[in-house]
């Protein structure tokens, strides 16, 4: 008979035979034969394989290096890799989160649009007219100018994107 050229899902072709793949969390020890099934063994401590596979070695769990600002977000299993994230005040430099950088601060004239997370940096936006920020901060949004009118005061000095308005008393007309 013709040897198979393709195998079913969760099988692989070797020596003209379809062998079962090893399940996630296990590695290949020996291929199946005409009379025996594929031999698989569980991955060791700190190892994983996350797919049906014919790998002869399991992958090492990712190491979350504290010297790079990393910490474990989710511990790895025999079927999943460890997920790293960054320490408070830091965020990942890439999707793989192999190192961390300090969250950026928004300069005066800019406010925080989106606070940084373990995986994304601070997003700043320029303070629009009517708003200001006079500090460099990773948390502060643009604040609205003070409304002098509500305090029964008048604007003595116009506000900018970096400074609030300065209010003062209204000039009184004498009779």
């Amino acid at each position: 008979p013709e040897p198979p050229t393709a195998c079913r899902e969760k099988q692989y072709l070797i020596n003209s035979q379809c062998c079962s793949l090893c399940q996630p969390g296990q590695k290949l020890v020996s291929d199946c034969t005409e009379f025996t099934e594929t031999e698989c063994l569980p991955c060791g401590e700190s190892e994983f394989l996350d797919t049906w596979n014919r790998e002869t070695h399991c992958h090492q769990h990712k190491y979350c290096d504290p010297n790079l600002g990393l910490r474990v977000q989710q511990k790895g299993t025999s079927e999943t890799d460890t997920i790293c994230t960054c320490e408070e005040g830091w965020h990942c430099t890439s999707e793989a989160c192999e190192s961390c950088v300090l969250h950026r601060s928004c300069s005066p004239g800019f406010g925080v649009k989106q606070i940084a997370t373990g995986v994304s940096d601070t997003i700043c936006e320029p303070c629009p007219v009517g708003f200001f920020s006079n500090v460099s901060s990773a948390f502060e949004k643009c604040h609205p100018w003070t409304s002098c009118e509500t305090k029964d005061l008048v604007v003595q000095q116009a506000g900018t994107n970096k400074t609030d308005v300065v209010c003062g008393p209204q000039d009184r007309l004498r009779a």
């Epitope: 008979p1 199946c32 034969t33 009379f35 025996t36 099934e37 031999e39």
Partner: antibody, heavy 113, light 107 residues
């Protein structure tokens, strides 16, 4: 009884199952000794190809007549140490374990001058 | 070739006894181990395959266990009809090989 250097053919008639679907094997047992696997012939799906143990390779052949459900063992260049009871056996199973699940009654072969 | 060793070539027991027969392989055979019974008249039957799976029609007093290189056949409540020779056989690697047999007799 057969002389050393001589030839002999054994046959084994099967019934009660679809003969061509199964691997068929020959096993022998010298008097007072252990069983010894000699060889098998694969089923139709696997092209009726054969495998043999080193002790008989090149001297013994296995064939089958699937229309009559008969298994054959052709033995050539016989030696005294080939004296034994010869069994035919059906070889079945899955990759989770193959086994000889149906055995013939056995036939005695004596090689002597 | 894989060598199969049955250290006990003969043993005697009484009716109702629990009997265990051992078999050792020269290398790991991954549970590809079968047990056969040969009656005094030469009739051979499969009892257990893949270490512990009972062949159809075999009484439940027969059981098998083991792993790696060491395997055993147990007859839990010996009956007269169990008087026979028992052979182990590895099915992992060609050539298939048998143990030397363990002859069970009645006391």
């Amino acid at each position: 009884l057969v002389q050393p250097g001589g030839s002999l053919s054994l046959s084994c008639a099967a019934s009660g199952f679809t003969f061509s679907d199964y691997y068929m094997s020959w096993v022998r047992q010298p008097p007072g000794k252990a069983l010894e696997w000699l060889g098998f012939i694969r089923n139709k799906a696997n092209g009726y190809t054969t495998e043999f143990s080193a002790s008989v390779k090149g001297r013994f052949t296995i064939s089958r007549d699937n229309s009559q459900s008969i298994l054959y063992l052709q033995m050539n260049a016989l030696r005294a140490e080939d004296s034994a009871t010869y069994y035919c056996a059906r070889y079945g199973g899955l990759r989770q374990g193959w086994y000889f699940d149906v055995w013939g009654t056995g036939t005695t072969v004596t090689v002597s001058s | 070739d894989i060598q199969m060793t049955q250290t006990t070539s003969s043993l005697s027991a009484s009716l109702g006894d629990r009997v265990t027969i051992s078999c050792r392989a020269s290398q790991d055979i991954r549970n590809y181990l079968n047990w056969y019974q040969q009656k005094p008249d030469g009739t051979v039957k499969l009892l257990i395959y893949y270490t512990s799976r009972l062949h159809s029609g075999v009484p439940s007093r027969f059981s098998g266990s083991g792993s790696g290189t060491d395997y055993s056949l147990t007859i839990s409540n010996l009956e007269q009809e169990d008087i026979a020779t028992y052979f182990c056989q590895q099915g992992k690697t060609l050539p298939w090989t048998f143990g030397g047999g363990s002859k069970l007799e009645m006391k």
